[in-house]
């Protein structure tokens, strides 16, 4: 269930555009990332597309929003409360925030200045 | 690295029992731990979670209201509080490392709790 | 609740032949993020449980490589493809998708 968000602006607007852009790509190109570093000594490829893939398909998604710089941070923010129960230790949570407010300018879009990924009523 | 339980024992229908479990060799305050036992005979049945900061505890549905885990970073241990203990509470209680992506990737060698009269 | 099913129960096994063991959950272990929340763990007798395989088909470290997960979704395989000696013990399937359920194991012995 999708908390409060009460952000100041336009939160409306942007929650309506969150909901309709599919966030599924970023969270499994985040997922990727982080465990590429723990898959170094496996023979096995556990992921079904690449993260470059995954990575395109996550900016295409995100480009859907009209107002990218400003509803970025609730797109963030969204994935973050997606996967944070995924996410058992401090190292995780906090390689899964940086991946996160890496993800704009991945996606050649402006970061947003201020966001806070502390959210999911403190789960996270 | 590894983990050391401590605390079983025998104890009667409706009395209660603390197992303790020392951590070293890793950052213990950074990681989520579990409680997972084992019946004579039977298989594994995980028991309790609790998250590296305590903001989440979870457990089985059959201990709850009778069993709290807890954690003190300060001293790398983790406790399993267990009260109301009956027959079926009979088991071999493994305190379990969560990797931090929700899989166990170092288990202690367990202890013993029997539960009779 | 998840509930976890393996097959078979036991497994009397020839060194040097391959070996599979199945498991099914009540409902799908993919999660929004692309994983398959489904580990596979052996517990060798007279020890503790040791980690095999995580996220449906990834190898844990030290785990020799005749050892291999695959399935999506509900249906999940380990493979040996030669079964050594020291791989007897009791092998479990486990999800931790939602919360965490181990099926009811599968006894792998020597013929």
């Known amino acids: 269930m999708r908390r409060e968000r009460g952000r100041q602006g336009d939160s409306s607007s942007c929650e309506r555009q969150v909901d309709r852009v599919n966030l599924k790509p970023c969270e499994q190109h985040i997922m990727q990332r982080i465990m590429g570093e723990q898959e170094q000594y496996d023979s096995y490829d556990i992921r079904s597309t690449r993260s470059s893939d995954q990575q395109q398909r996550c900016c295409d998604e995100l480009n859907e929003m009209e107002n990218t710089q400003r509803c970025m941070c609730e797109a963030l923010q969204q994935i973050m409360e997606n996967q944070c129960d995924r996410l058992q230790d401090r190292q995780m949570v906090q390689q899964f925030k940086r991946e996160l407010m890496n993800l704009p300018q991945q996606c050649n879009f402006r970061a947003p200045q201020r966001c806070d990924l502390d959210v999911s009523g403190g789960r996270c | 690295v590894q983990l050391v339980e401590s605390g079983g024992g025998v104890v009667q229908p409706g009395g209660s029992l603390r197992l303790s479990c020392a951590a070293s060799g890793f950052t213990f305050r950074d990681y989520g731990m579990h409680w997972v036992r084992q019946a004579p005979g039977k298989g594994l049945e995980w028991v309790a979670f609790i998250r590296y900061d305590e903001r989440n505890k979870y457990y089985v549905d059959s201990v709850k209201g009778r069993f709290t885990v807890s954690r003190d970073n300060s001293k790398s241990t983790l406790y399993l509080q267990m009260n109301s203990l009956r027959a079926e509470d009979t088991a071999v209680y493994y305190c379990v490392k969560d990797s931090g992506l929700r899989y166990f990737n170092l288990w202690g060698r367990g202890t013993l709790v029997t539960v009779s009269s | 609740d998840i509930v976890m099913t393996q097959s078979p129960l036991s497994l009397p096994v020839t060194p040097g032949e391959p070996a599979s063991i199945s498991c099914r959950s009540s409902q799908s272990l993919l999660h929004s993020n692309g994983y398959n929340y489904l580990d596979w763990y052996l517990q060798k007798p007279g020890q503790s449980p040791q980690l095999l395989i995580y996220f449906g088909s990834n190898r844990a470290s030290g785990v020799p490589d005749r050892f291999s997960g695959s399935g999506s979704g509900t249906d999940f395989t380990l493979n040996i493809t030669r079964v050594e000696a020291e791989d007897v013990g009791v092998y479990y399937c486990?999800?931790?998708?939602?919360?965490?359920?181990f099926g009811q194991g599968t006894k792998v012995d020597i013929k």
């Open positions: 486990m999800q931790a998708l939602q919360s965490w359920t």
